[in-house]
């Protein structure tokens, strides 16, 4: 049974019975605010294998492990997230272990496990086997590992049953509880899931399967589920739904929107059954199930009740998806996040008009404001104190506002304010004054030339490429040796490159300050010989593919007032040479007479150039005597060749712990006082925790229904 559109279990633990027949929860699962400690041992939901959105646990007294409740939960898809997270375990007072021993995949989003005073077995789980990226996981304020003494099955008897992996340079056993190992698939399966017996599942399976290489035996599907089969795409006349299954037109037409009773019903668009037309499209008539393109952007007015909309996470940005006119003020405060630039563009990229002010502060994750890629008008009908309608304060990594060569933005009323943006060059701000029509409105105090751009290469010399050579999968480029005023200040060069089918990329595409970057980066040391031009060989490239490349000099040079002087090249577009195409696909031959063969094939998946012709070769084969030597009717099977398995025993190295002593026999050192940077980081960390907690409370505490 598919349950949904989201299950909220609160106050009374007996509500858990609602999960009894669920195999998939299409939506989220909240279990929260159960203040009376209960005995959960009689509650067990072995049928539940998939949650399509997220799982949130908050203040559930008496619950000690999730393993008994959800023994077969295998996949949390994270189709929609709770403040960037797909799994949140917060203030669970009695939880001793997570215990979700069958959890194999969190498809999107991170995890947040915080303030669970009794929670152990956190350091024994290798989350990198479950999530794509673990850098945004937030595991804080739980039981200290030293007090836990987590032991994986069999380690006491010196017969360890679990496998080992390395986390933070620590090679150790991985398990969920004292008697449940963390399942790992053989390396031969690659990214594929596997059965309990370590046989590889079908590529379309996700998490696990009951039989190998069988797309009908998957516990969950990598892409879509239809009629008992996992499929890479929905078959004709069916439509993607909720990110995981295929449904027909009738099903889509009969869905009632959970959001509002007066909704116009779901629509079918671009092969998907969805609640409303996506951005750029509008219903083809009020009762229509189909979407047509808008002429220009579709008008969608979004209004914020509280006048000011705070964007502090992907979740809060999600609310603005499709909005073209925002009635109110935007306060952008993005301190961290995964792939934040592209996620924000996804949800805010269509906003054209903001009627109030735009304030960007403490957004250390932002490198550019280009995610607001269609913003063309700030009306400034409401302004901040001091008559500001565009206010940019303390954004430690902001380097670019917009690409002013391709951008028209008007600020109708109000002034601009910029302070403490150390990587934002003042010339970029003055360019914005010109473009937006605010020149002359700002006072001297509104744009501080000292604390904006003081850590940026605002004075940039141009590096010129001197030669480019290409082969099918390599590019060799050289450039003029840059000579800053003091030659010793040139440290090295960084080469940035990426595939660029079109000549429209910018330096800041897909870039945020948390590590996401669509550019590949290579460091190039200075040639020891001062007469040799620096250069690089980029290898492992795709044949017949256009790449964008640019180079930056890494320098120490400062000009007066601590402004760094740097150098970078223009973006160069260069195509690799053509190569031999991959083999033609799906070759079929059939004889239609005693003297003819008909051969059919599909084009190669990698043409590696412009295909001009195919060569078909054939030759007569002598009949193989081997075919006659074996009796195919006998029960003896043809022997199968065995291959050596290349496993290596890894010997564990244990070092003696070192005790640091200060000044001879003075005994152990005391902790160093915290640096200003550490104190600041702690302060920001505390603030981030508060913001999340506020978001949690605002999301889950709702008025009782009348």
């Amino acid at each position: 049974e598919i349950c949904g559109p989201g299950i909220d279990i609160r106050n009374d633990y007996q509500q858990l019975k609602r999960l009894e027949n669920c195999t998939v929860i299409e939506g989220y699962l909240h279990i929260l605010l159960i203040s009376k400690a209960e005995d959960y041992r009689s509650y067990r939901f072995p049928k539940l294998t998939v949650i399509t959105e997220y799982l949130l646990l908050f203040r559930v007294a008496g619950l000690e492990s999730l393993g008994d409740l959800f023994p077969n939960l295998t996949v949390i898809r994270g189709w929609k997230l709770f403040y960037n997270y797909a799994l949140v375990i917060f203030e669970m007072t009695n939880l001793k272990d997570i215990g979700l021993y069958n959890l194999r995949n969190i498809t999107r989003g991170a995890i947040r496990i915080e303030k669970n005073a009794d929670l152990c077995y956190l350091s024994t789980v290798d989350w990198s086997l479950i999530l794509d990226a673990v850098s945004n996981n937030y595991i804080v304020g739980n039981k200290p590992p030293k007090e836990c003494g987590d032991l994986c099955p069999g380690t006491m008897e010196e017969k360890p049953m679990c496998e080992k992996t390395t986390i933070n340079n620590e090679y150790n056993y991985r398990c969920w509880t004292t008697n449940r190992c963390q399942k790992m698939c053989p390396s031969t399966c690659g990214k594929r899931a596997c059965t309990e017996n370590n046989e590889c599942c079908h590529p379309e399976c996700l998490g696990s399967c009951s039989a190998p290489d069988n797309d009908t035996a998957c516990v969950a599907c990598r892409h879509y589920y239809y009629a008992g089969v996992c499929v890479p795409a929905c078959p004709p006349n069916t439509y993607r739904f909720e990110g995981w299954r295929c449904v027909d037109r009738d099903f889509c037409a009969n869905i009632l929107s959970a959001e509002s009773s007066d909704s116009e019903g779901f629509v079918i668009h671009d092969g998907e059954c969805m609640q409303e037309c996506p951005s750029g499209f509008i219903r083809n008539g009020s009762q229509s199930m189909y979407c047509i393109p808008c002429e220009g952007p579709c008008p969608k007015v979004c209004e914020e009740e509280k006048k000011t909309k705070t964007i502090d996470s992907v979740t809060s940005a999600q609310m603005l998806q499709g909005c073209t006119i925002f009635k109110g003020n935007l306060l952008i405060n993005i301190r961290r996040g995964n792939n934040i630039a592209s996620e924000l563009e996804n949800f805010m990229g269509l906003i054209e008009v903001v009627t109030g002010y735009v304030k960007i502060r403490h957004s250390h994750a932002l490198v550019s404001l280009s995610f607001l890629k269609n913003l063309r008008l700030i009306l400034g009908e409401e302004q901040l104190e001091g008559n500001y309608s565009f206010y940019v304060l303390d954004n430690q990594n902001l380097q670019q506002l917009w690409d002013w060569d391709h951008r028209n933005l008007t600020i109708k009323a109000g002034k601009m304010y910029f302070a403490f943006n150390p990587k934002l060059c003042v010339s970029e701000i003055y360019r914005m004054e010109e473009v937006t029509g605010t020149k002359g409105r700002q006072s001297k105090g509104d744009i501080n030339t000292r604390n904006n751009g003081e850590r940026a290469s605002c004075e940039s010399d141009v590096l010129h490429f001197t030669s480019t050579t290409t082969s099918k999968n390599r590019i060799i480029i050289t450039w003029h040796r840059y000579r800053p005023p003091d030659y010793r200040d040139l440290i090295s060069f960084t080469v940035y490159y990426k595939e660029a089918p079109f000549k429209n990329v910018t330096e800041y595409d897909g870039q945020d300050a948390c590590g996401s970057n669509s550019w590949n980066m290579v460091d190039v040391d200075l040639p020891p010989n001062k007469d040799v031009e620096p250069g690089i060989l980029l290898h492992g490239l795709k044949p017949w593919t256009q790449y964008a490349v640019y180079v930056k000099a890494v320098t120490l040079t400062m000009v007066e007032n601590d402004h760094i002087r740097g150098a970078k090249s223009e973006i160069l577009y260069i195509r690799t040479n053509a190569s031999v195409p991959s083999i033609p696909l799906d070759v079929l031959s059939a004889s239609n007479s005693s003297s003819q063969l008909i051969v059919k094939w599909n084009p190669p998946s990698l043409p590696n150039g412009n295909l001009s012709y195919y060569i078909v070769r054939w030759q007569r084969q002598p009949q193989d005597g081997y075919l006659y030597r074996h009796n195919y009717c006998s029960k003896d099977k043809i022997p199968i060749r065995k291959y050596a398995d290349g496993t290596i025993d890894i010997e564990e190295v244990t070092e003696n712990p070192k005790t640091e002593v200060c000044g001879g026999e003075k005994g152990p050192c005391c902790a160093c006082p915290k640096t200003e940077a550490e104190k600041q980081a702690e302060k920001e960390e505390a603030e981030y925790r508060k913001v999340f907690e506020n978001f949690l409370h605002n999301s889950i505490f709702v008025p009782r229904p009348e």
């Epitope: 304010y417 003042v426 010339s427 003055y430 105090g445 030339t449 751009g453 007066e560």
Partner: antibody
Framework: QVQLQQWGPGLVKPSGTLSLTCAVS?????????WSWVRQPPGKGLEWIGE???????NYNPSLKSRVTISVDKSKNQFSLKLSSVTAADTAVYYC????????????WGQGTLVTVSS | DVVMTQSPLSLPVTPGEPASISCRSS???????????LDWYLQKPGQSPRLLIY???NRASGVPDRFSGSGSGTDFTLKISRVEAEDVGVYYC?????????FGGGTKVEIK
């Protein structure tokens, strides 16, 4: 120590163009400062003409805007003033000055150049 | 434009005595960042102006501590606690908040 050295012709004919240059030494013109021109007619007070940032961004006094051009030459570490269609009312001592970090105060001044407009 | 009005026009002083010059602006020079964008300059005969006080009350480097600036918003004062003979010249106030930057008409300080 930053120094501003200015030069230019002391006599300009009416309807001609006044041209002055100010060289910055002991510091870079590409620092986070604005560079201004101020003038003082004989026996009168000070009048701000305009300013430039090293990126080329400028602000001018509206009363002179149609006749003024201020430019910067980063390679020579200097900036220049051009005032067109001059009349006798433009006779003054012209000063170049540095607006420290664009915060609206002049901490360094040139020595001044007296420009007389006369035929 | 912001109009700056200075008084008195002329100030005869006795060495060792205090002196005070007033400056009023047509609109507030107090920015939301808390600074008053008002500066004081001294121009001695035949010389370029020299910065004395910036952003309301900050003494420029090398300026003796007998000079002090005070005031906020639209009313400002330059005080010389004990005038010395070398302090003669024309004192100008200037608003540095809005372009065009504008100067007061000047106050001529001379020894009695």
């Amino acid at each position: 120590q930053v120094q501003l050295q200015q030069w230019g012709p002391g006599l300009v004919k009416p309807s001609g163009t006044l041209s002055l240059t100010c060289a910055v030494s002991g510091g870079s013109i590409s620092s986070s400062n604005w560079w201004s021109w101020v003038r003082q007619p004989p026996g009168k007070g000070l009048e701000w003409i305009g300013e430039i940032y090293h990126s080329g961004s400028t602000n001018y006094n509206p009363s002179l805007k149609s006749r003024v051009t201020i430019s910067v030459d980063k390679s020579k570490n200097q900036f220049s003033l051009k005032l067109s269609s001059v009349t006798a009312a433009d006779t003054a001592v012209y000063y170049c000055a540095r607006d420290s970090s664009g915060q609206g105060y002049f901490d360094y001044w040139g020595q001044g150049t007296l420009v007389t407009v006369s035929s | 434009d912001v109009v700056m009005t200075q008084s008195p026009l002329s100030l005869p002083v006795t060495p060792g005595e205090p002196a005070s010059i007033s400056c009023r602006s047509s609109q507030s020079l107090l920015h939301t960042n808390g600074y008053n964008y008002l500066d004081w300059y001294l121009q001695k005969p035949g010389q370029s102006p020299r910065l004395l006080i910036y952003l309301g009350f900050n003494r420029a480097s090398g300026v003796p501590d007998r000079f002090s600036g005070s005031g906020s918003g639209t009313d400002f004062t330059l005080k010389i606690s004990r005038v010395e003979a070398e302090d003669v010249g024309v004192y100008y106030c200037m608003q540095g908040l809005q372009t065009p930057l504008t100067f007061g008409g000047g106050t001529k300080v001379e020894i009695k």
